[in-house]
Amino acid sequence: FERTRSLQDPCSNCPAGTFCDNNRNQICSPCPPNSFSSAGGQRTCDICRQCKGVFRTRKECSSTSNAECDCTPGFHCLGAGCSMCEQDCKQGQELTKKGCKDCCFGTFNDQKRGICRPWTNCSLDGKSVLVNGTKERDVVCGPSPADLSPGASSVTPPAPAREPGHSPQ
């Protein structure tokens, strides 16, 4: 089947990095500068991606593969193939429309990206809070109150400071 296809369609012989040039009797012509073809038998070459602004070039475009971008310092990639660059925030913050905002009480973010998430609810596993949570760190759960020896004690987190809707641990 492959042989009959190549007899019928001379373009199928054009390798990656070339295109089948209809204007030149279906000759395999090399991709022009700033374009590529990653598979054989293509009738056109694709324009190389350009990494501009907050994007920087991670891998240069070649005749057979597209350029790859990442983000300049202070930004990180989002989406397939780094289609967007999103601003970094500090630990203990999350990105909103207005920029980086501190995590609300009862939530934390230990990374420079992503959203603030709630402290672990220790009581779900029958445990108690050993170390209180902060904006940057989750709570540390310890043994359940029943497991503690008479002299030991566990830390109880402060009551939510009027932050709406937080379910205290």
């Epitope: 429309k97 905002k101 959203i115 998430r117 709630p118």
Partner: antibody, heavy 121, light 111 residues
Framework: QVQLQQSGAELAKPGTSVKLSCKAS????????IYWVKQRPGQGLEWIGN????????FYGEKFMGKATFTADTSSSTAYMLLGSLTPEDSAYYFC??????????????WGQGVLVTVSS | QVVLTQPKSVSTSLKSTVKLSCKLN????????VHWYQQHAGRSPTTMIY?????PDGVPDRFSGSIDSSSNSAFLTINNVQTEDDAIYFC??????????FGGGTKLTVL
């Protein structure tokens, strides 16, 4: 592809409880908030609360504290909402929805199909 | 407490342009993103506009979103209105990043 599949309609008597489920597929369940939203027939949308399945941390709207309880089973990628002490006021559609991990004020990108809870004696 | 106010109902004619409003009662409309959902009867909401003015894949470019800080409002504009646009439209924003707020919804009737 991402899907949120909710359990079937519920008919309950006043004073009883119902447990609604929301089974997630097509993404990492522990890395996104699941929100629960109430809609009475012909009315608007009302935030009940949300859960971070990764650690079971929860938030509740003031109106729903003591009414709703959220849990999540990571082994089956399912979020649950228990509605207690039911009254006719709890008769509504209940939706679960996912919020992307993009920004703190982001939209709900996927919704469950909704489940109708009817409270009647 | 943050409230988003939408007109209860709006009527428009086929192929016309309609602009639905969502007014924030306190604070600044620019503080948090505004999102718009469409809901047909008996269905779950679907996103029409997110992050003020972005359109998800598959949503016709007849739909657009905007913010007007002078009126402290967000707007959903639908050009060349079609019969399938007959639905309820909800706006959605935040009071704090853990407290989402919805508008009451606008029932759009296409005549």
């Amino acid at each position: 592809q991402v899907q949120l599949q909710q359990s079937g309609a519920e008919l309950a008597k006043p004073g009883t409880s119902v447990k609604l489920s929301c089974k997630a597929s097509g993404y990492t369940f522990t890395s996104y908030y699941i929100y629960w939203v109430k809609q009475r027939p012909g009315q608007g949308l009302e935030w009940i609360g949300n859960i971070w399945p990764g650690n079971g941390g929860t938030f509740y709207g003031e109106k729903f504290m003591g009414k709703a309880t959220f849990t999540a089973d990571t082994s089956s990628s399912t979020a649950y909402m228990l509605l207690g002490s039911l009254t006719p006021e709890d008769s509504a559609y209940y939706f679960c929805a996912r919020r992307p991990d993009y920004s703190g004020d982001d939209y709900f990108d996927y919704w469950g199909q909704g489940v109708l809870v009817t409270v009647s004696s | 407490q943050v409230v988003l106010t939408q007109p209860k109902s709006v009527s428009t004619s086929l192929k016309s342009t309609v602009k639905l409003s969502c007014k924030l009662n306190s604070g600044n409309i620019g503080s948090y993103y505004v999102h718009w959902y469409q809901q047909h009867a008996g269905r779950s909401p679907t996103t029409m506009i997110y992050r003020d003015d972005k359109r998800p894949d598959g949503v016709p470019d007849r739909f657009s979103g905007s913010i007007d800080s002078s009126s402290n409002s967000a707007f959903l504009t639908i050009n060349n209105v079609q019969t399938e646009d007959d639905a309820i439209y909800f706006c959605h924003s935040y009071d704090s990043t853990i407290t989402p707020v919805f508008g009451g919804g606008t029932k759009l009737t296409v005549l």
